[in-house]
Interface confidence: medium
């Protein structure tokens, strides 16, 4: 089972008020990067996995959930240095003896190839080229994600030019 990711759709034929409205825009908050239907925030500081998880929560987001290999590649393309690693929202569930996403779904064997041990207190991080497991207590950078939000910009017609 893959991590479920909500999709946003935009209906541009919505009711118009007297003020002309542009079609709804999908915007990421400032400092967040848009990657298809997600907004990503790459941390500058380092934290253990649990603290990274908590930090994303305070930002009304979650640690990164990766749907498939294509999304992994798109995310890795944003990592500009081979020496940097980022926690994602995947850790090893000892009770279920499987890799588990923080939304409760399990890792499909085809999705990500994880280098490293699958054992208690193991969490997953990504680098520019690979996916690894490491002790969750290790402090490293992390990636938060949130779904794109609908923002309606009210503008006058001549500002469209």
């Amino acid at each position: 089972q893959k991590p479920s990711i909500g999709k946003c759709s935009v209906d541009i034929q919505q009711n118009r008020t007297k003020t002309t409205e542009r079609p709804d825009l999908l915007n990421c908050p400032i400092y967040w990067q848009q990657v298809q239907e997600k907004c990503l925030l790459f941390s500058h500081t380092v934290n253990p996995w649990n603290n990274s998880l908590a930090d994303c929560s305070t930002k009304e987001s979650s640690l990164l959930l990766i749907q498939d290999k294509d999304e992994l590649t798109r995310t890795q393309n944003l990592i500009h240095d081979k020496a940097i690693s980022f926690w994602i929202g995947l850790n090893f569930s000892l009770s279920e003896k499987n890799w588990k996403w923080i939304n409760g779904s399990f890792l499909s064997s085809n999705d990500l190839k994880i280098t490293g041990d699958a054992k208690e207190n193991s969490c997953v991080y990504i680098s520019q080229t690979s996916v690894y497991s490491e002790y969750c207590s290790t402090e490293m950078k992390w990636i938060c994600q949130k779904e794109l939000t609908l923002v309606r910009n009210k503008v006058s017609p001549d500002s469209w030019l």
Partner: antibody, heavy 122, light 108 residues
Framework: QVQLVESGGGLVKPGGSLRLSCAAS????????MSWIRQAPGKGLEWVSY????????YYADSVKGRFTISRDNAKNSLYLQMNSLRAEDTAVYYC???????????????WGRGTLVTVSS | DIQLTQSPSSVSASVGDRVTITCRAS??????LAWYQQKPGKAPKLLIY???SLQSGVPSRFSGSGSGTDFTLTISSLQPEDFATYYC??????????FGGGTKVEIK
Amino acid sequence: QVQLVESGGGLVKPGGSLRLSCAASGFTFPQYYMSWIRQAPGKGLEWVSYISPSGATIYYADSVKGRFTISRDNAKNSLYLQMNSLRAEDTAVYYCARSLMSTGTHLYFDLWGRGTLVTVSS
Amino acid sequence: DIQLTQSPSSVSASVGDRVTITCRASQGISSWLAWYQQKPGKAPKLLIYAASSLQSGVPSRFSGSGSGTDFTLTISSLQPEDFATYYCQQVTSTPPYTFGGGTKVEIK
């Protein structure tokens, strides 16, 4: 100016103790993994220990485990190495080094101090 | 522990020469390898990290390659300031972060 400056080296008898300090400046010290690396006279480099940014994760080389203690004071931008039960084979120049980027898993050392010499001899 | 074997232990070369130093790991380390330059009485300087990434400020005549167990540092055209000792270092996720024995590049 981005730099690391070690101090505290000197001559000590076998079985004695010494505390090395490393003062960091010019960068955000609390965000970085820090290490001690040593080099015996005329020999190669040997990694000794590292400490994570918060101090929660620490590793030692087997050769110093149980005798050396690494610590840090982020408020003072300082790294320390307490060396006990010193042996002749601990004689070396001790370097303080910063990890490249603030990532914990792959420790490349991009900033080094000039080193401080520790001599263990009777 | 992972062992790193550098070869040659020393090399004599002239200014303008192409110099190649190899580093072999006792087990696979992916691309987690660095190269350092050290001059007498000085601290080491990071040249290459992640096997092939050039550290900021390092001249482009230095390059690194390799993956798994075999790695190479190449100096394309040796300059007078390049005469030094070069070390490789592995940085897989579990310490110790071992160094190779070093390669001394001397003036012929």
